[in-house]
């Protein structure tokens, strides 16, 4: 059913979404310090806009006695609750930011009459793509996937001079809610990635994983996985492995690489961390100062998506266009607007688009280095360090499968 | 000592590429953050690319998605690729090294400085 908008006559209002499942354990306090931050930004730059209207933020939680797993497995019908609570109430906002879960935000999306744009930190699956007036800002699975298929294709760089077509996948179902549809996307047979492969197999049980380490009868030699080196550990522990064995380890949301006393640990050697490029300014900011590395990424995409808004907001209003509008809740993409810390870029489909890094762990030094970037908006790889210190034989990447002949290679002449 | 040549500036018209590339002696590069820097007739030196020493590479937004960096250690060489040149591009082009403090920042000041290389963008 239509619900009246708080949103006209000078006087706009936010819906946040505070839901018990959510993609991130963290605690509903900091979202609260992380919307309040932005909220005060965005305050500013209409004033010196000479905007001279009300913004505010109506915190709307969810009722935990029904939803308290914390757990987006069990999200579907939270995000469809707290709608209806809206209605009930008669308050809903010119937006809504929230849920993450990817479960709730398409069941939302499916199930309401969506004339309002929604901002979600997460939504990362496949089933969230497309969506006219969704917008999401932190990395949905489709840009993973289009890193991982222009890496398997790269081989013109002076370290990797083999295309690749296969791979392994490990996913054993405890991953946490960015990596569950990260390799729910990388498994999908329907999906880019497996499109693009010749070969791909999941492995779901520790012992798979461990047994291929060693196998000389593999189909490949590059295993995805998704969390932090911890899980890794846990999986791999001191394992010994195959020479030409190559790990990517997907940790996108993890600023712990970056932290200058940082000493690689000898079970990443093999590894290949794909990361995201690190902020400038969010270790002294006043809302993150609370926030783990892991948890930064989360807290800043709330923080962001007010920012967003005040921008939309700023530009309608300076156009004298009215802000209840279709029109309204479809300008949320294909924009760059001034984020917390710098420039946010929303692609076509309104999902954020940033810098991957792929690091690698120098075998002389023991610390991560960068060996590439790829720049989401452009699916495009840039080579970092053109003579990386390896483990890998004469500092190359292996072939993806052993002993294949030179078909494969690139040569330069 | 210390030393950094630059090299491969030239005149290219709109829209073309150059790369330059910065021959370091005297340091590696694992321990220094490398910067590239323009200046144009009349105007103050801007800083347009830094490589933290980790790797890390950080773009001033007038040239982010244009121009990237990178670094041969076996080589002792920086290099400065610029693609979709324009006319406002036109400077000269000094590499810069500074120990590093950071192994992911980019320096506030740098230490030592080469002696440029011309870059012209005209039809």
């Known amino acids: 059913s239509q619900v009246s908008q708080n949103c006209h006559n000078g006087s706009y209002e936010i819906s946040v979404l505070m839901m018990g499942n959510s993609a991130f354990a963290e605690p509903l306090k900091n979202l609260e310090d992380a919307v309040n931050e932005g909220l005060e930004i965005v305050r500013g730059r209409l004033q010196n806009a000479g905007l001279n209207v009300t913004v505010n933020a109506t915190f709307m939680y969810s009722d935990g006695l029904i939803h308290n797993s914390g757990d987006c497995r069990s999200s579907t019908c939270e995000g469809l609750d707290l709608l209806r609570k809206i209605s009930n109430a008669q308050r809903m906002g010119c937006v809504l930011i929230g849920p993450s879960c990817t479960y709730s935000t398409f069941q939302m999306y499916l199930d309401t009459e969506l004339s309002y744009p929604m901002i979600s930190a997460g939504s990362f699956g496949l089933s969230c793509d497309y969506k006219e007036t969704l917008t999401r800002l932190m990395s949905p699975a489709r840009k993973l996937m289009y890193f991982l298929v222009n890496f398997w294709k790269t081989n013109d760089l002076p370290f990797k001079t083999y295309s690749w077509s296969t791979s392994y996948v490990y996913k054993n179902g405890t991953e946490t809610e960015d990596c569950f549809w990260y390799l729910n996307a990388l498994e999908a047979s329907v999906s880019y990635f497996s499109h693009e492969l010749g070969f791909k197999v999941v492995l779901r049980q520790d012992k798979e994983f461990q047994d291929i380490l060693m196998d000389h009868n593999r189909k490949s030699n590059v295993i995805i996985m998704c969390g932090g080196p911890e899980f890794l550990y846990k999986l791999k522990g001191d394992r010994a492995v195959a020479e030409d064995i190559v790990i990517i380890l997907v940790d996108l949301f993890n600023d712990q690489y970056f932290e200058d006393n940082v000493t690689a640990p000898d079970y990443m050697k093999n590894v290949l961390v794909l990361t995201l490029s690190p902020g400038n300014s969010l270790l002294n900011s006043s809302f993150s100062r609370n926030l783990s590395p892991t948890k930064r990424d989360f807290a800043l995409a709330y923080l962001n998506g007010i920012l967003l808004f005040g921008h939309m907001l700023k530009i309608f209003l300076e156009n004298g266009e009215n802000i209840t509008t279709p029109k309204f809740a479809h300008a949320f993409r294909n924009l760059t607007f001034e984020g917390y810390d710098g420039p946010v870029t929303l692609d076509d489909w309104g999902d954020v688009d940033s810098t991957m890094v792929l690091l690698y762990t120098s075998v002389d030094t023991k610390k991560y280095k960068v060996l590439l970037t790829y720049d989401t908006h452009v699916n495009k790889t840039y080579p970092v360090d053109m003579s990386p210190t390896f483990t890998w034989k004469n500092s190359k990447l292996p072939n993806d499968i052993t002993g294949r002949g030179p078909q494969h290679h690139h040569h330069h002449h | 000592q210390l030393q950094l040549v630059e090299s491969g500036g030239g005149l290219v018209q709109p829209g073309g590429s150059l790369r330059l590339s910065c021959v370091t002696s005297?340091?590696?590069?694992?321990?220094?953050?490398i910067g590239w820097f323009r200046q144009a007739p009349g105007k103050e030196r801007e800083g347009v690319i830094c490589?933290?020493?980790?790797?890390?590479?950080k773009y001033a937004d007038s040239v982010k998605g244009r121009f990237t960096i990178s670094r041969d250690n076996a080589k002792n060489t920086v290099y400065l690729r610029m693609d979709s040149l324009k006319p406002d591009d036109t400077a000269v082009y000094y590499c810069?090294?500074?120990?590093?403090?950071?192994?992911?920042?980019?320096?506030?000041?740098?230490?030592?400085w080469g002696q440029g290389t011309q870059v012209t963008v005209s039809s």
């Open positions: 810069a090294a500074s120990g590093a403090t950071s192994r992911w920042n980019c320096p506030p000041q740098y230490d030592h």
């Open positions: 005297g340091f590696t590069l694992d321990d220094y953050a």
């Open positions: 490589l933290t020493s980790g790797g890390l590479p």
